[in-house]
């Protein structure tokens, strides 16, 4: 038997992936566990094997179909169970009725690129990945720029309160190396959270033109 506190948290990427983390104090690392998904109005079931990510937590991804296929809707409920092998049988460790569109976490934005760079400004664009068409334009973004000598945690957050897949960074220092990241969040869902940060995009501002003597 396993004692201690347990937590089972899952997010839907809005298309065909449910990612889950199960944590259990005092659980054995070598225990074989899985997540089982049982939708209330679909003919499919899905299972993934929980793999350790730390001393007392395990994670897995339920792949529901092709990455851009719309496998669930706002009316779906998926019963999710954590099952761990105990001898010859499987024991249910955790259970929840999961409402996918109340628990959204999108994939990190992709395809970041510098559209135009000058001495003091830089225009950057990106794309969202595997995001449901249900959202239409109901998305928001956060962006941050890493300046020399600073950490990502110190970088001020820039908020884009609409579906805008570009930004113009201003008041930059000439001939300076920067890095840029962006993340996305749907407006829908009580437990919805920000996507992971995108891969950093490195860019350098142009040097200032040499001034002429007057």
């Amino acid at each position: 038997a396993v004692n201690g506190t347990s937590q089972f948290t899952c997010f839907y990427n809005s298309r065909a992936n449910i990612s889950c983390v199960w944590s259990q104090d005092g659980a054995l690392q070598d225990t074989s566990c899985q997540v089982h998904a049982w939708p209330d109005r679909r003919r499919w079931n899905q299972t993934c094997e929980l793999l350790p990510v730390s001393q007392a937590s395990w994670a897995c991804n339920l792949i529901l179909g092709a990455p851009d296929s719309q496998k669930l809707t706002t009316v779906d409920i998926v019963t999710l169970r954590v099952l761990c092998r105990e001898g010859v049988r499987w024991r249910v460790m955790a259970i929840q009725d999961f409402k996918p569109f109340e628990n959204l976490r999108l994939m990190a934005p992709i395809s970041l690129q510098v559209v135009h760079v000058e001495t003091h400004r830089c225009n950057i664009s990106w794309e969202i990945s595997q995001a449901s068409h249900y959202f239409e334009r109901h998305l928001e973004f956060e962006a941050r720029t890493l300046s020399p000598g600073h950490t990502w945690e110190e970088a001020p957050l820039l908020t884009l309160k609409q579906k805008q897949e570009w930004i113009c960074l201003e008041t930059l220092t000439p001939d300076t190396q920067y890095e840029f990241q962006v993340r996305v969040k749907p407006l829908q869902g009580e437990f919805t959270t920000w996507s992971p940060w995108s891969q950093p995009l490195a860019f350098r501002t142009k040097p200032a033109a040499l001034g002429k003597d007057t």
């Epitope: 038997a1 249910v92 259970i95 929840q96």
Partner: nanobody, 126 residues
Framework: QLQLVESGGGLVQTGTSLRLSCAAS????????MGWFRQFPGKEREFVAA????????VYVDSVKGRFTISRDNAKSTVYLQMNSLKPEDTAVYYC???????????????????WGQGTQVTVSS
């Protein structure tokens, strides 16, 4: 270990009431949801009702909604099933069950429950 002992079954007339009780002993602090299943002769056990750890959530099979009520008294480590307007088709062996699984669902299955009582016979005569 955890033990569950049912009581309150018996033979009753159609339209009357019966209250089943289930007392838990042993490691009762591990219990989360508790519930009742029933088994008709030659059939699989079927879910009847369940109640969450704090009693705030309950769920019933459609055939007993409005007639049966599940409740629990955590201080006494006991769960109850109040059965009103009984019908001959309610005749079955009723099993108390408990789980230490964390969380809640409205779609309980037999495999969700790791602890079972011995069962108590309920017979409804017409």
């Amino acid at each position: 270990q955890l033990q569950l002992v049912e009581s309150g079954g018996g033979l009753v007339q159609t339209g009357t009431s019966l209250r089943l009780s289930c007392a838990a002993s042993g490691h009762t602090s591990r219990i989360n949801a508790m519930g009742w299943f029933r088994q008709f002769p030659g059939k699989e056990r079927e879910f009847v009702a369940a109640i969450s750890r704090n009693g705030g959530s309950t769920v019933y099979v459609d055939s007993v909604k409005g007639r049966f009520t599940i409740s629990r008294d955590n201080a006494k480590s006991t769960v109850y099933l109040q059965m009103n307007s009984l019908k001959p088709e309610d005749t079955a062996v009723y099993y108390c069950t408990a789980t230490d699984a964390v969380g809640w669902t409205t779609r309980w299955m037999t495999a969700d429950f790791g602890f079972w009582g011995q069962g108590t016979q309920v017979t409804v005569s017409s």
